[in-house]
């Protein structure tokens, strides 16, 4: 598979994880594979085995540390490698110099809950995870309502351009069951992607007074 | 736009050395890992050595290694590749390329491509 097209893509997520993704066609699905991560400027070294998670693709996380400690800085470079066993011996298939703080997917928000109800409007609140506090307040939010009879692919998006850790999302009909999801990404960064989804909040809007005109 | 222009090719005998260079301009250019690759006559193009920019992380072909010597000068934005003990199945159409992050054997990771230079290995 000298010829066929691979794919090494990892991402920091700011403050004590590498996740990387390696995919290769025509490579064997129980091919023995490891990224080793050697940084510029500091002590350690880190290794993960990558593991299956399609027909040609592998991943893994490389733990630096404890998860809220702050393992790399923006001056960081960590050179990542492939390394896949063929019989006797480790062949690096690439190579990478990595730039932390450009390649940044931080952690899902989580901790969601719903602030308040009415029956047309609903103030949902969330908190981000392992994020560095270097970025201060640059950071932006996407979040989503799935309305009934409709998919996730088809909810519009609403835009945060600021870290704002609420939203209240108004116009909606009462007595109805909804589900929300919100995802964080940092201004910083060349390669920069969008966090997972959060984990969907269902709530339900309270139903319209009798006899009130809504 | 990156624009890579390969020089130092020429007619060398069996056992001789040649260093090639590829010099890389365009606005583009951001510290992109650079690789060389041969083709020869009838044959598909193959992967011969490539190195990363900033820590100058090296690749190279099982058949090449412990001959040939892939660097680069930052300053100059140039890659050289050092080639001793040639031998005449080292003949051939030898290309610079660049990828955008990675450097890997595969020619379909690297995204612009130099027009050649040839080498010729008389024995």
């Known amino acids: 598979a000298v010829n066929g097209t691979s794919q090494f893509t990892c991402f920091y997520n700011s403050r004590a994880n590498i996740s990387c993704v390696w995919s290769q066609d025509g490579a064997l699905q129980d091919t023995s594979c490891q990224v080793h991560a050697w940084p510029d400027r500091r002590r350690w070294n880190q290794t993960c085995e990558l593991l299956p998670v399609s027909q040609a693709s592998w991943a893994c996380n490389l733990i630096l540390g404890a998860p809220d400690s702050q393992k790399l800085t923006t001056v960081d470079i960590v050179t990542l490698r492939v390394l896949c066993r063929e019989g006797v011996r480790w062949r690096v298939m690439a190579i990478q110099d990595f730039k932390p703080f450009e390649n940044l997917r931080l952690m899902a928000p989580i901790s969601l809950q719903v602030v308040h109800v009415e029956t047309h409007r609903c103030n949902i609140s969330w908190e981000i995870s392992q994020a560095s506090h270097y970025f201060e307040r640059h950071l932006e939010f996407e979040a989503r309502t799935l309305s009934p009879g409709h998919t996730w692919e088809e909810a519009p998006l609403l835009t945060l351009k600021q870290k704002q850790e609420w939203i209240c999302l108004e116009t909606l009909t009462p007595d109805t069951q909804y589900e929300f999801q919100v995802r964080v990404k940092p201004l910083q960064g060349e390669f920069t992607t969008w966090s997972p989804w959060s984990q969907p909040l269902a709530f339900r809007t309270k139903p319209a007074a009798l006899g009130k005109d809504t | 736009q990156v624009q890579l222009v390969e020089s130092g090719g020429g007619l060398v005998e069996a056992g001789g050395s040649l260093r090639l260079s590829c010099a890389a301009s365009?606005?583009?250019?951001?510290?992109?890992?650079m690789g060389w690759f041969r083709q020869a006559p009838g044959k598909e193009r193959e992967f011969v050595a490539a190195i990363t920019w900033i820590s100058g992380s090296t690749l190279y072909a099982d058949s090449v290694k412990g001959r040939f010597t892939i660097s680069r000068d930052k300053s100059k934005n140039t890659v050289y590749l050092q080639m001793s003990g040639l031998k005449p199945e080292d003949t051939a159409l030898y290309y610079c390329?660049?990828?955008?992050?990675?450097?890997?054997?595969?020619?379909?990771?690297?995204?612009?491509w130099g027009q050649g230079t040839q080498v010729t290995v008389s024995s």
């Open positions: 390329a660049a990828a955008l992050k990675t450097i890997t054997r595969g020619q379909h990771d690297y995204t612009y």
């Open positions: 365009g606005r583009a250019f951001n510290n992109f890992p």
